[in-house]
Amino acid sequence: EPTMYGEILSPNYPQAYPSEVEKSWDIEVPEGYGIHLYFTHLDIELSENCAYDSVQIISGDTEEGRLCGQRSSNNPHSPIVEEFQVPYNKLQVIFKSDFSNEERFTGFAAYYVATDINECTDFVDVPCSHFCNNFIGGYFCSCPPEYFLHDDMKNCGVNCSGDVFTALIGEIASPNYPKPYPENSRCEYQIRLEKGFQVVVTLRREDFDVEAADSAGNCLDSLVFVAGDRQFGPYCGHGFPGPLNIETKSNALDIIFQTDLTGQKKGWKLRYHGDPMPCPKEDTPNSVWEPAKAKYVFRDVVQITCLDGFEVVEGRVGATSFYSTCQSNGKWSNSKLKCQPVDCGIPESIENGKVEDPESTLFGSVIRYTCEEPYYYMENGGGGEYHCAGNGSWVNEVLGPELPKCVPVCGVPREPFEEKQR
Amino acid sequence: IIGGSDADIKNFPWQVFFDNPWAGGALINEYWVLTAAHVVEGNREPTMYVGSTSVQTSRLAKSKMLTPEHVFIHPGWKLLEVPEGRTNFDNDIALVRLKDPVKMGPTVSPICLPGTSSDYNLMDGDLGLISGWGRTEKRDRAVRLKAARLPVAPLRKCKEVKVEKPTADAEAYVFTPNMICAGGEKGMDSCKGDSGGAFAVQDPNDKTKFYAAGLVSWGPQCGTYGLYTRVKNYVDWIMKTMQENSTPRED
């Protein structure tokens, strides 16, 4: 259990300590305190480097001191013959004696007290990025105006995150731009546009000045753009090194500006706007797009009309055209629909006639109806030839879709009548 | 047929056989048979056969039987209480509408109707063919089809022949322009049982075809001159009747 103070005495003190002793004491004071260890009496066999008998003071892995011999106070007002101040809350004291003592030595008497440490000054590494405030048993960090203390309670940064930009056009700059940006900050800006618009970022070279990269090429301060699974950057240096126009192909963009503790520059300024998501002009054979444009963007609607003799088949129903919309993901709706050749189907049978099976029943195919000669003939003309028309009907040049009519040939006997002479 | 020769149905594929009364008719298309009014006036549901030279019962079983749907008698035909005493055969023409269409082939095919032009006006001496299973010189009814070629004659030739078994005064018999007189050569003539059959004349505009210029109607005496219904005078009535009683399938 940690204690605020305590006493440590060598074995048999104030009598002579025995030979061949090794004893250790673990001192622990509450966290946030250091330890002041002082000796009021010291009488230990003297040897070079205290090799025979000694009292050792260890802090962690470091030996703070090793004592032997006799000491007396230099100050008539103070009984302290030796003292140690450590800024840690743990300390180990080890007493060792060898196998023989030429004289009678009385050992040592020591006391420890918990002392306040000044974390703000006592360490090489400054605990706070900005202002350090010491108090008994601890310290706290504080920040200049407009800065806030991060969750680590040590670092200060500017409150530059959480902004969400939803307007179709806007401007974003680093904090204090064009004055130097704050050190030790992570600024996150979110652009969230309506689906169907892609964020396009525009920067001018002269509007960018960020602490340059180290010798290994790593940015110390950096600007990064993240759009979904795509990343642009990190960027740093004097003058913007990336493309001046960044087409993100996404409606959501995160801008992350990370700075370290040193080397603040003027920062950066950018403009962004939302471009309607483009849809590629797809190659749809046997069709015409209306309206015809060089570029199609989100919410554009086109009517795709099949050329004569072609149709789009959806759910086994044929149509000559369909509508397609440029969607928010940059893809066309109804993209599976295609204009395919019209199929006129199996030609109808006719009474007293026949139709030869065509090679194909698709647009442009030709069929020929014939009547059962010599007993029937084609009454309504047209020659019997039909082609598969664009409307899905078998059509004759004379009769249109009307089928030929095979009617009986009249008045023709198969064999002429011959009178038998009597 | 008196004075005729044996014929094959292939010579007269339009020939229709009526078994009650024993008579004839002419097929004019898939759905219609033309016959004499006096043939069907007493039996409005006649049984008809096509495609067979012989009308032997066993042969008829193998031939095509036609079922009537309706009989249309010319409105000018006078219906009598006692048909046996008839002296007026004017408008002796009727149409029989068939239930099902007839399939044409070498033994069954229609005869043409006369055109309305003057080309189809008959002249004396024009030859026509008659056929049927009616009385012959030897028997009351022929089993095999008989036929004869005979010329058109002036109507007076028919008037001059004495009626064999008159049922009234000779003057009572009516002769009209709706009748054709034909025969008088080598005793060739139609006779009882041939009624309704066609008097087939070669088409003046297409020598390969025959048209029904007349229908066997009546006569004063078999083996002399016979009277035939002049079909040309009824073409409008025939066309109108067929048109008004057709199905869309025929239109």
């Epitope: 088949v313 129903v317 189907g345 030609p347 109808e348 049978s349 006639g353 026949k354 030869e356 | -």
Partner: antibody, heavy 118, light 109 residues
Amino acid sequence: EVMLVESGGGLVKPGGSLRLSCAASGFTFSNYAMSWVRQAPGKGLEWVATISSGGSHTYELDSVDGRFTISRDNSKDTLYLQMNSLRAEDTALYYCARLFTKHAMDYWGQGTLVTVSS
Amino acid sequence: QIVLTQSPATLSLSPGERATLSCTASSEVSSSYLHWYQQKPGKAPKLWIYSTSNLASGVPSRFSGSGSGTDYTLTISSLQPEDFATYYCHQYYRLHPITFGQGTKLEIK
């Protein structure tokens, strides 16, 4: 007289095969497109397949496509339906029918019963 | 696929009454390709009316058919005992050759 006579039906286990025949007479068979239509017990009519007059074009119901094949032999005036991978739901009376103008079925056979059951 | 829906499923009427059978298509059908069949128990169907309004051979004139687009009707002006049967409508469309309605059973009341 037009006549269509079906044969080849019977009891078959699921997964089995049958070949139905339809003998035509009384008309020029090779002049007409033909169809098979089925009727499950107590149910309505369901078109199964159609074949063109010469036999080179066929259409089949989606649910039988790949399992059933319609064919014809014009020299024998016969229509066929080869049925493979039969299922219980194929149980029906199978009719053959002649296709007339506007693809109306003007003559039907009396049907042959196919029962698919284990 | 064009679906044909017939109504009513069953129609109970007495001889002499007028019968009206309806057939509704899920999308437009050409009137030339809409047909009706009559089927009696244990018998094969018979073509009854073809191309919407044309009576098949042997069908009495008390039967008539009408309609266009998606709505078609078979009417019997005065029912006779032999008319009681099941009637099916049927359509042909080149992209899906043939579909039938589920049938209307006309029964004696």
